[in-house]
Interface confidence: medium
């Protein structure tokens, strides 16, 4: 025997109190699939969570984060504060990257500069707190007699000294 509830479409629920008739989801609730016996409560985006997509009878609301924060986790389950480029988030807030490390985003951790010598290359542009070093040709390629290489003009000032 077919379950009468299977005929209830998304946006409705199978109301046991009304002889399993399909009733619309009440305000601020939804059902995203058919045959549901209940509707789920809509997510409310408040505080640092902003509404990216309103709740409908067939789909949950979606949140993102207010300016100064970015989403983390499935479905933006957390809002984490942004830092500036050249910084990372620590337990005490945003801190500058240590010398020898960089972060070119508003999130994430400071990462070590590329070690050009590991690839047998030279440093073409020094690293900064915000940018990785740019590796150039290997020292052998720059020896007399080798084809000349004109390095591009650095996009920014050379790396800073240790703090």
């Amino acid at each position: 025997l077919q379950d009468p509830c299977s005929n209830c479409p998304a946006g409705t629920f199978c109301d046991n109190n009304r002889n399993q008739i399909c009733s619309p989801c009440p305000p601020n609730s939804f059902s995203s699939a058919g045959g549901q016996r209940t509707c789920d409560i809509c997510r409310q985006c408040k505080g640092v969570f902003r509404t990216r997509k309103e709740c409908s009878s067939t789909s949950n609301a979606e949140c993102d984060c207010t300016p100064g924060f970015h989403c983390l986790g499935a479905g933006c389950s957390m809002c984490e504060q942004d830092c500036k480029q050249g910084q990372e988030l620590t337990k005490k807030g945003c801190k500058d990257c240590c010398f020898g490390t960089f972060n070119d985003q508003k999130r994430g951790i400071c990462r070590p500069w590329t070690n050009c010598s590991l690839d047998g290359k030279s440093v073409l542009v020094n690293g900064t707190k915000e940018r990785d070093v740019v590796c150039g040709p290997s020292p052998a390629d720059l020896s007399p007699g080798a084809s000349s290489v004109t390095p591009p003009a650095p996009a920014r000032e050379p790396g800073h000294s240790p703090q």
Epitope: R43, K46, F49, C76, M78, E80, Q81, K91, G93
Partner: nanobody, 125 residues
Framework: EVQLLESGGGLVQPGGSLRLSCAAS????????MSWFRQAPGKGLEWVAV????????YYADSVMGRFTISRDNSKNTLYLQMNSLRAEDTAMYYC??????????????????WGQGTLVTVSS
């Protein structure tokens, strides 16, 4: 009854100062990170500043950085917002909020479970 009650709002001239207070009752204030939010007329809710449960970690929106200072006195169950160099664009209803889950600068969804009723700040000459 769990309650947050803001006070200290009012009319102030541009460049002036105000100190908002938020008195907490009915819950263990020292277990909660606290934030200030504001809502300007016709605008959405804007986060202003947060302070961790023990007061060691503070973070501010760029728009108020260097002008506003958030602080708390857990012995008095009170949150404060010292507002200096006020501008017309700071005009808003200011709300305090308590959230149980604030870790490493992150708010977890569903953690904003205690809200005040707000206090109005008007900056005008």
């Amino acid at each position: 009854e769990v309650q947050l009650l803001e006070s200290g709002g009012g009319l102030v001239q541009p460049g002036g100062s105000l100190r908002l207070s938020c008195a907490a009752s009915g819950f263990t204030f020292g277990d909660y990170a606290m934030s200030w939010f504001r809502q300007a007329p016709g605008k959405g809710l804007e986060w202003v500043a947060v302070i961790s449960d023990d007061g060691s970690n503070k973070y501010y929106a760029d728009s108020v950085m260097g002008r506003f200072t958030i602080s708390r006195d857990n012995s008095k169950n009170t949150l404060y917002l010292q507002m200096n160099s006020l501008r017309a664009e700071d005009t808003a209803m200011y709300y305090c909020a308590g959230h149980y889950d604030y870790v490493w600068g992150s708010f977890r969804y569903g953690a904003f479970d205690i809200w005040g009723q707000g206090t109005l700040v008007t900056v005008s000459s």
